[in-house]
């Protein structure tokens, strides 16, 4: 019989008492085969973290700073359940740490040196740890003691709870630096008042502070937020302009064998029976013998944290950077206006080898990081382990939802001004063998399908989006008799046709021979009835252009396109017979890396781009014998995006809407995790 006990960790007598009450009340409402609670008492949160890691306890609820400690080795804990605040309809699990300024003050984030600062309190999250952590490497050396460095960075501050004797500049704007509401500039409202009164130039608070203190929109309009990219935004655009997005209070568990499903089952049932306004005799979110015992008193309920979400992703790049800076106190040697090498994310061995070749030739400008899937790469870019990669539009969508931005677009047509003219896109097509003359768009049911990969534009999002509109369900593996759609569940019929060996079968990388445009076409040639690819795929792999044994004798005339009106056309008539126009592949990165990635990639394409005539004697960035490694092989250049610099603008309203509709069918664990952070 599986042990269905969750050992909850309590950090005080009062918590232990509430935990026992929680245990007893749960016993009274949950059947004997359901989850139960046991209580473990420890002296501190850090002791609880260690106890969970050592399998002496299973769960505890932590503030963001402690979630970071819990994630660090050797603890390796992960967030499993989040408390939410506000309403069930609009649950808030995060708050945003922001830098508020007066509208007419005219400075940016990188011009804070010498300004006057208002803080909620020394050592507090939004008011101190996050802003000072993010500014850490701009502080004058020596950076220890930290208070002294901060005092020398700003021209004056109010940092309640600081030592006014040792660091008088930190108390300059609020004499005495009192650590309670007796100090008019203490806490969120106090820090905002410090700005409002004109004592300070910037207030470090949370996003709701402005709304709580200024009910009138006209008054709020006198203030702006400083963004990390050295721009400003209105105060209601805090989701796009903040210092960090911080989880409020989170249940953590072991990463391996952590009982996360059991913990969720327990807490979900607990909130049903003892949540807000549910029961008189025991209340989960109430602490008669103290404050915030086990859970925050202000919580309204729990949400399950998506399983793909590790602590780094949950806390977010900015928060982790800030806390790591404060804890480790290390800063790069190089001056910050110089670009560090760009860490390119490479999929599997084939891409890594090409990336390493690029790295050697780039003379230190490019470094390489490996991952097994595109989603793993996106996650690595999010958390700073990697910086950039080129993605199909379907993954540009996911990357965008995860906070990444497009920075350059692949262009596929030769033109005089390639780098300045991003193209409208390429065509997504459905290819069949000419010999299968009865096959049309209208009778694909039961046929064998070949896809570039799940989540990609031409191979999945466009054809499956169109199909979804027709069949109104997501069971595509039942619609086709079998197929190869790399990235599908291994036991799905959409992995049956794939050719990868062992663990590589149906993997969404080049270890699966039927992956990507060339792979999907090969799947059609060797096993399938229809391949969903781009309009250039057939000509690029026929007429001897692909020397591989399977392709060297293929003829373009032996293939035709399926048109949406039920007719068929020759391959060269793609402009009048396609499924949709697809946005070109694009390079994505984090916002903080945008300028450097743009600069270095433009240098790199001038050295190794299409202007290189002899690829047998020189490294060519856009060539890999039809394998589309790192970039599509038909890339002519990487083009500036001009104002199409967000994923929505880049992909276009129509495509974003199409992918949005298909999200009901999404199997992307990363997309689920990212929409948890930003619904």
């Amino acid at each position: 019989v599986p042990d269905k006990t969750v050992r909850w960790c309590a950090v005080s007598e009062h918590e232990a008492t509430k935990c026992q009450s929680f245990r007893d009340h749960m016993k009274s409402v949950i059947p004997s085969d359901g989850p139960s609670v046991a209580c473990v008492k420890k002296a501190s949160y850090l002791d609880c973290i260690r106890a969970i890691a050592a399998n002496e306890a299973d769960a505890v609820t932590l503030d963001a700073g402690l979630v970071y400690d819990a994630y660090l080795a050797p603890n390796n804990l992960k967030p499993v359940v989040a408390e939410f605040y506000g309403s069930k309809e609009d649950p808030q699990t995060f708050y945003y740490a922001v830098a508020v300024v007066k509208k007419d003050s005219g400075f940016q984030m990188n011009q804070l040196r010498g300004k006057k600062s208002c803080h909620t309190g020394l050592g507090r999250s939004a008011g101190w740890n996050i802003p000072i952590g993010l500014l850490y490497c701009d502080l004058p050396e020596p950076r220890k003691p930290l208070e002294k460095a901060v005092a020398n960075f700003f021209s004056g501050s109010c940092a309640p709870c600081a030592d006014g004797t040792d660091f008088p500049q930190l108390c300059q704007l609020c004499p005495g630096c009192g650590c309670s509401t007796l100090n008019q500039y203490f806490g969120y409202s106090g820090a905002f008042k410090c700005l409002k009164d004109g004592a300070g130039d910037v207030a470090f608070v949370k996003h709701s502070t402005i709304f709580e203190n200024l009910a009138n929109k006209a008054d709020r309009d006198q203030y702006e937020l400083l963004c990390l990219d050295n721009t400003r935004k209105p105060v209601d655009e805090y989701k796009d302009c903040h210092l960090a997005q911080v989880p409020s209070h989170t249940v953590v568990a072991r990463s391996m064998g952590g009982k996360e499903d059991l913990i969720w089952e327990l807490l979900n049932q607990a909130q049903e029976h003892f949540g807000k306004d549910k029961s008189k005799e025991f209340q989960l979110f109430s602490s008669p013998h103290g404050k915030d015992l086990l859970f925050k008193d202000s919580a309204h309920g729990f949400l399950k944290v998506p399983p793909r979400m590790d602590a780094k992703m949950y806390l977010g790049y900015e928060y982790v950077t800030a806390i790591r800076n404060l804890r480790e106190g290390t800063c790069p040697e190089a001056p910050t206006d110089e670009c560090k090498p760009v860490k390119w994310c490479a999929l599997s061995h084939h891409e890594r080898l090409k990336c390493d070749e690029w790295s050697v030739n780039s003379v230190g400008k490019i470094e390489c990081v490996s991952a097994e899937t595109t989603e793993d790469c996106i996650a690595k870019i999010m958390n700073g382990e990697a910086d950039a990669m080129s993605l199909d539009g379907g993954f540009v969508y996911i990357a965008g939802k995860c906070g990444l931005v497009p920075v350059l677009a692949e262009n596929y047509n030769k033109s005089d001004n390639c780098e300045d003219t991003p193209e409208a896109g390429y065509f997504a097509i459905a290819v069949v063998k000419k010999s299968a003359s009865d096959l049309t768009w209208d009778n694909l049911k039961g046929k064998k399908s070949c896809h570039t990969a799940v989540g990609r534009t031409a191979g999945w999002n466009i054809p499956m989006g169109l199909l979804y509109n027709k069949i109104n369900h997501c069971r595509f593996d039942e619609f086709f008799s079998e197929g190869c759609a790399p990235g599908s569940k291994k036991d799905s019929s959409l992995c049956k046709l794939c050719m990868g060996s062992g663990l590589n079968l149906c993997e969404p990388n080049n270890k699966e021979g039927y992956y990507g445009y060339t792979g999907a076409f090969r799947c059609l040639v060797e096993k399938g009835d229809v391949a969903f690819v781009k309009h250039q795929t057939v000509p690029q792999n026929t007429g001897g252009k692909n020397p591989d044994p399977w392709a060297k004798n293929l003829n373009e005339k032996d293939y035709e396109l399926l048109c949406l009106d039920g007719t068929r056309k020759p391959v060269e008539e793609y402009a009048n017979c396609h499924l949709a126009r697809a946005p070109n592949h694009a390079v994505v990165t984090r916002k903080d890396k945008e300028a450097c990635v743009h600069k270095i990639l433009r240098q790199q394409q001038h050295l190794f781009g299409s202007n290189v005539t002899d690829c047998s004697g020189n490294f060519c960035l856009f060539r890999s014998e039809t394998k589309d490694l790192l970039f599509r092989d038909d890339t002519v250049c990487l083009a500036k995006l001009h104002d199409r610099n967000t994923y929505e603008k880049y992909l276009g309203e129509e495509y974003v809407k199409a992918v949005g509709n298909l999200r009901k069918c999404s199997t992307s664990s990363l997309l689920e995790a990212c929409t948890f952070r930003r619904p």
Epitope: D356, S359, V360, N361, V363, G364
Partner: nanobody, 112 residues
């Protein structure tokens, strides 16, 4: 001006071994890494192995476990130890470092 010279090639039976060396004249050799390529008759030149300045190495999948690349900066030399050679390994082997033209290469022939 750095020049590269490859040596160590020859005719060998399948299953045999060879050790290729790449010696550079001039300074600053391999500071950004060195790559061994090969070219079989009528085929594209392909990357075989590389070694970066920090000692990181990587190999083409078909030679992994059989070939080992190493370097001795004091001797301005990079080696390619090739074991369990196969007929498909036949070709002219070249070493390359950024900014330096290809040398003459060294012929490796593996007979079955």
């Amino acid at each position: 001006q750095v020049k590269l010279e490859e040596s160590g090639g020859g005719l060998v039976q399948a299953g045999g071994s060879l050790r290729l060396s790449c010696v550079a004249s001039g300074s600053g050799f391999g500071i950004n890494g060195v790559i061994w390529y090969r070219q079989a008759p009528g085929k594209q030149r392909e990357l075989v192995a590389l070694i970066k300045s920090d000692g990181y190495t990587n190999y083409r999948e078909s030679v992994k476990g059989r070939f080992t690349i190493s370097r001795d900066d004091a001797k301005n030399t990079v080696w390619l130890q090739m074991n369990a050679l196969e007929p498909e390994d036949t070709g002219v082997y070249y070493c390359k470092t950024p900014g330096v033209p290809f040398g003459q290469g060294t012929q490796v022939t593996v007979s079955s």
